[in-house]
């Protein structure tokens, strides 16, 4: 359920507020609907960077749970093959605040277009 993914993103934003994590993360800020699965996989990969950089058990657990929920939701859509989409490394690097904002936006796209 994508709303549960949103809920975990809110938890992560709450948890990182008191931390100073200056990592930059590959961020897709203008997702074409035909590349949303590819973009989501990039977001999930980059999310693990936040988990590692924070060194915080609560963030680690929430990230782990979010990835499971998102992958379950993606697999329920069936095996979607997308072509012509950007590789993760081709995306713009942004700070954590902007990354999470764009992450919420893409999850909302999955909800809105389902």
């Amino acid at each position: 359920n994508w709303v549960n993914v949103i809920s975990d993103l809110k938890k992560i934003e709450d948890l990182i507020q008191s931390m100073h994590i200056d990592a930059t993360l590959y961020t897709e800020s203008d997702v074409h609907p035909s590349c949303k699965v590819t973009a989501m996989k990039c977001f999930l990969l980059e999310l693990q960077v936040i988990s590692l950089e924070s060194g915080d058990a609560s963030i680690h657990d929430t990230v782990e749970n979010l990835i499971i929920l998102a992958n379950n939701s993606l697999s329920s859509n069936g095996n979607v093959t997308e072509s012509g989409c950007k590789e993760c490394e081709e995306l713009e690097e942004k700070n954590i605040k902007e990354f999470l904002q764009s992450f919420v936006h893409i999850v909302q796209m999955f909800i809105n277009t389902s």
Epitope: I6, D14, D30, V31, S102, V104, H105, I111, N112, T113
Partner: antibody, heavy 119, light 108 residues
Framework: QVQLQESGPGLVKPSGTLSLTCAVS?????????WSWVRQPPGKGLEWIGE???????NYNPSLKSRVTISVDKSKNQFSLKLSSVTAADTAVYYC????????????WGQGTLVTVSS | SSELTQDPAASVALGQTVRITCQGD??????ASWYQQKPGQAPILVIY???NRPSGIPDRFSGSSSGNTASLTITGAQAEDEADYYC???????????FGGGTKLTVL
């Protein structure tokens, strides 16, 4: 600076169709944002009507879904609202608004246009 | 009925602090945003996300969230803060946007 401007008839007859257009300037309707219509009956609160993404995806308030159509015209940088089978209860100020990126919000609003349903 | 509940009215003495709340189970998943609306005018976004202010919004406005409640706090209320305040978020499905019923703030 993004600006939104609603236009359309200020008076609609009962059982008729309310039609409004929102012209977007200072930004592109083909941005990553979703675009919404919100209304406010006189002396009452705000009610979300529905939203559209420039690829044509739409979502509507369940209580209005059977009567609402929102469409987008990328060539004119505008989006439109049609509300059918109107009654006096649909009399309201109608606003168009741009949704922010990420968490729910409306970061830009039109000035609003009053639509009265009366014979 | 709205999925977001606000007290219909609140008041604050000039220069004092007031907190306006918004309740709803959907706020466990989503942050709320807050709008100020003065008579005859369109709403203005004052707080969005965790606690973000759009440019031009005074820093006396702040937002917070705990459990199923979102709060808008005005620290050192001014006469020009007298207005209706609305919260906004998404519903349980995540597909639909919803507003609270609004709180009319009077500055005494």
């Amino acid at each position: 600076q993004v600006q939104l401007q609603e236009s359309g008839p200020g008076l609609v007859k009962p059982s008729g169709t309310l039609s409004l257009t929102c012209a977007v300037s200072g930004g592109s309707i083909s941005s990553s944002n979703w675009w919404s219509w919100v209304r406010q009956p006189p002396g009452k609160g705000l009610e979300w009507i529905g939203e559209i993404y420039h690829y044509g995806y739409t979502n509507y308030n369940p209580s209005l879904k059977s009567r609402v159509t929102i469409s987008v015209d990328k060539s004119k940088n505008q989006f439109s609202l049609k509300l059918s089978s109107v009654t006096a209860a649909d009399t309201a100020v109608y606003y168009c608004a741009r949704e922010g990126i990420g968490w729910p919000s409306f970061d830009y609003w039109g000035q609003g246009t009053l639509v009265t349903v009366s014979s | 009925s709205s999925e977001l509940t606000q007290d219909p009215a609140a008041s604050v003495a000039l220069g004092q602090t007031v907190r306006i709340t918004c309740q709803g189970d959907t706020l466990r998943s989503y942050y709320a945003s807050w709008y100020q609306q003065k008579p005859g005018q369109a709403p203005i976004l004052v707080i969005y996300g965790k606690n973000n202010r759009p440019s031009g919004i005074p820093d006396r406005f702040s937002g917070s969230s705990s459990g199923n409640t979102a709060s808008l706090t005005i620290t050192g209320a001014q006469a020009e803060d007298e207005a209706d305040y609305y919260c906004n978020s998404r519903d349980f499905s995540g597909k639909n946007l919803v507003f609270g019923g609004g709180t009319k703030l009077t500055v005494l």
